[in-house]
């Protein structure tokens, strides 16, 4: 039961996280015009990974795409790449994890295969989350650097009568969405990996039984592996992929209220 819950929750958390990563990648508010300590403008600027926008007091919003690849900063390209890699890995991870879910029966798929798929999807979610967090962090670092550079420029070269106020940009909503989403995907991935340990067939148990049968003085009790395998004391040592056999996790296979988030 605990394994099913952990796996299901990991899937749902990862799903929310990946949806968040996609949302963050598409959002226009990666950086927004800094309003603090600046003259109040009737025009508000904000920028995303794909286009920059201007919202006027009139309510009119104009967005312009970055219709160039070579002219864009390398850092922006790197952030785009990280976010896309994160989305792709996350999407593949979701696809794999759907088939790996214990509550879904697909033919006569063995639990060992499900365990491998759960681990694979878990790793994919972890890498996906890390990609998103890295991408957002790189962009945030770029913003901080540019912010202080433009702040320095604001207070230099003002000897004349005419002042040019440089637009400074600060963290936009997409950064926070990206950090949270990346974190959720990472957590979901970790949960899937934990669930995998509980799904894996306990090969050590077979070895323990054969050892015992050979008459050695030292007998290995399968129950001793409880902590490391995630199994309960399954002294009967049934093959968990047998049709009629059930582990303690499978005793109640009907959905309970805890199976849904």
């Amino acid at each position: 039961m605990a394994v099913t819950a952990c796996q299901g929750l990991g899937f749902v958390v990862s799903l929310i996280g990946i949806a968040g990563i996609i949302a963050a990648t598409c959002m226009d508010q990666w950086s927004t015009q800094d309003l603090y300590n600046n003259p109040v403008t009737a025009v508000f600027n904000y920028q995303g990974l794909w286009r920059s926008c201007v919202r006027e007091s009139s309510g009119f919003t104009e967005c312009r795409g970055y219709f160039t690849l070579l002219g864009l900063p390398a850092m922006l390209q790197a952030v785009r790449a990280l976010m896309i890699v994160g989305i792709v890995l996350g999407a593949i991870g979701l696809l794999v994890s759907i088939f790996a879910l214990k509550c879904i029966r697909i033919g006569s798929m063995e639990d060992s295969a499900k365990a491998n798929m759960t681990l694979t999807s878990g790793i994919m979610f972890i890498v996906s989350g890390l990609c998103a967090i890295a991408g957002v962090s790189v962009f945030a670092n770029m913003l901080v650097t540019n912010f202080w550079m433009s702040t320095a420029n604001m207070y230099t070269g003002m000897g004349g009568m005419v002042q040019t106020v440089q637009t400074r940009y600060t963290f936009g909503a997409a950064l926070f969405v990206g950090w949270v989403a990346g974190g959720l995907t990472l957590i979901g991935g970790v949960m899937m990996c934990i669930a995998c340990r509980g799904l894996a067939p306990e090969e050590t148990n077979y070895k323990a039984v054969s050892y015992h049968a050979s008459g050695h003085s030292v007998a290995y009790k399968p129950g001793g592996f409880k902590a490391s395998t995630g199994f309960g004391s399954n002294t009967k040592n049934k093959k968990i992929y047998d049709g009629g056999a059930r582990t303690e996790d499978e005793v109640q296979s009907y959905p309970s209220k805890h199976d849904y988030v």
Epitope: Q33, P39, V40, T41, A42, V43, N45, Y46, Q47, S52, C53, V54, E56, S57, S58, G59, F60, E62, R64, V162, Q163, T164, V165, Q166, T167
Partner: antibody
Framework: EVQLVQSGSELKKPGASVKVSCKAS????????INWVRQAPGQGLEWMGW????????TYAEEFKGRFVFSLDTSVSTAYLQISSLKAEDTAVYFC???????????WGQGTLVTVSS | DIVMTQSPDSLAVSLGERATINCKSS????????????LTWYQQKPGQPPKLLIY???TRESGVPDRFSGSGSGTDFTLTISSLQAEDVAVYYC?????????FGGGTKVEIK
């Protein structure tokens, strides 16, 4: 056709209050801001501030904070300018204007002359 | 506040001649986000409300004759009437449409010589 129709001229005594109306037609009232502009006799244009009919949010120029209040009645697509504690120097023509994209004032009311005299 | 300085205060031009009005702002009105200059020009005839001529420094409002044109960027702007007509006699105002308060210039009175 977009139209802004303002209320008629007002003659008031110092210390009194006046409420100027600006009725909009020909467009969705809540979609565009209403600005107020003052023009004293023989003088230039002074931007007083604006009100967002969608949110009700107001922005005032520093010299028009306090005695000047912008308000709305969206049910009748009308914006109002209320001036309290009138002074002789408030004598002017008050215009309302629609804020359109490009932050431009594309349509203006005909103006309301407010005369403050004892 | 942004100070908008118009020059000259008044201008007398012969019919059919070119009239040029200058406007200078104390800070740049160029928005880096869309590379537009938030400067607007209005025409006001006696006893009438102002009429919009040019926005974004150089974009002519629909219905405005093409003899009116706007130019400039940053802090220096110009309104040009290529061939002055009798109906162009009015006061012309530039306005900062970028910073609050949305200040107007002092106005330039255009007359026929």
């Amino acid at each position: 056709e977009v139209q802004l129709v303002q209320s008629g001229s007002e003659l008031k005594k110092p210390g009194a209050s006046v409420k100027v109306s600006c009725k909009a037609s020909g467009y969705t009232f809540t979609n565009y801001g209403i600005n107020w502009v003052r023009q004293a006799p023989g003088q230039g244009l002074e931007w007083m501030g604006w009100i967002n009919p969608y949110t009700g949010e107001t922005t005032y120029a520093e010299e028009f904070k306090g005695r000047f209040v912008f308000s709305l009645d969206t049910s009748v697509s009308t914006a109002y300018l209320q001036i309290s504690s009138l002074k002789a120097e408030d004598t002017a023509v008050y215009f309302c204007a629609r804020l359109y994209y490009g932050n431009r004032f594309d349509s203006w009311g005909q103006g309301t002359l407010v005369t403050v005299s004892s | 506040d942004i100070v908008m300085t118009q020059s000259p205060d008044s201008l007398a031009v012969s019919l059919g001649e070119r009239a040029t009005i200058n406007c200078k702002s104390s800070q740049s009105l160029l928005n880096s986000g869309n590379q537009r200059n938030y400067l607007t020009w209005y025409q006001q005839k006696p006893g009438q409300p102002p009429k919009l001529l040019i926005y974004w420094a150089s974009t002519r409002e629909s219905g405005v004759p093409d003899r009116f044109s706007g130019s400039g960027s940053g802090t220096d702007f110009t309104l040009t009437i290529s061939s002055l007509q009798a109906e162009d006699v009015a006061v012309y105002y530039c306005q900062n449409a970028y910073y609050y308060p949305l200040t107007f210039g002092g106005g330039t009175k255009v007359e026929i010589k």
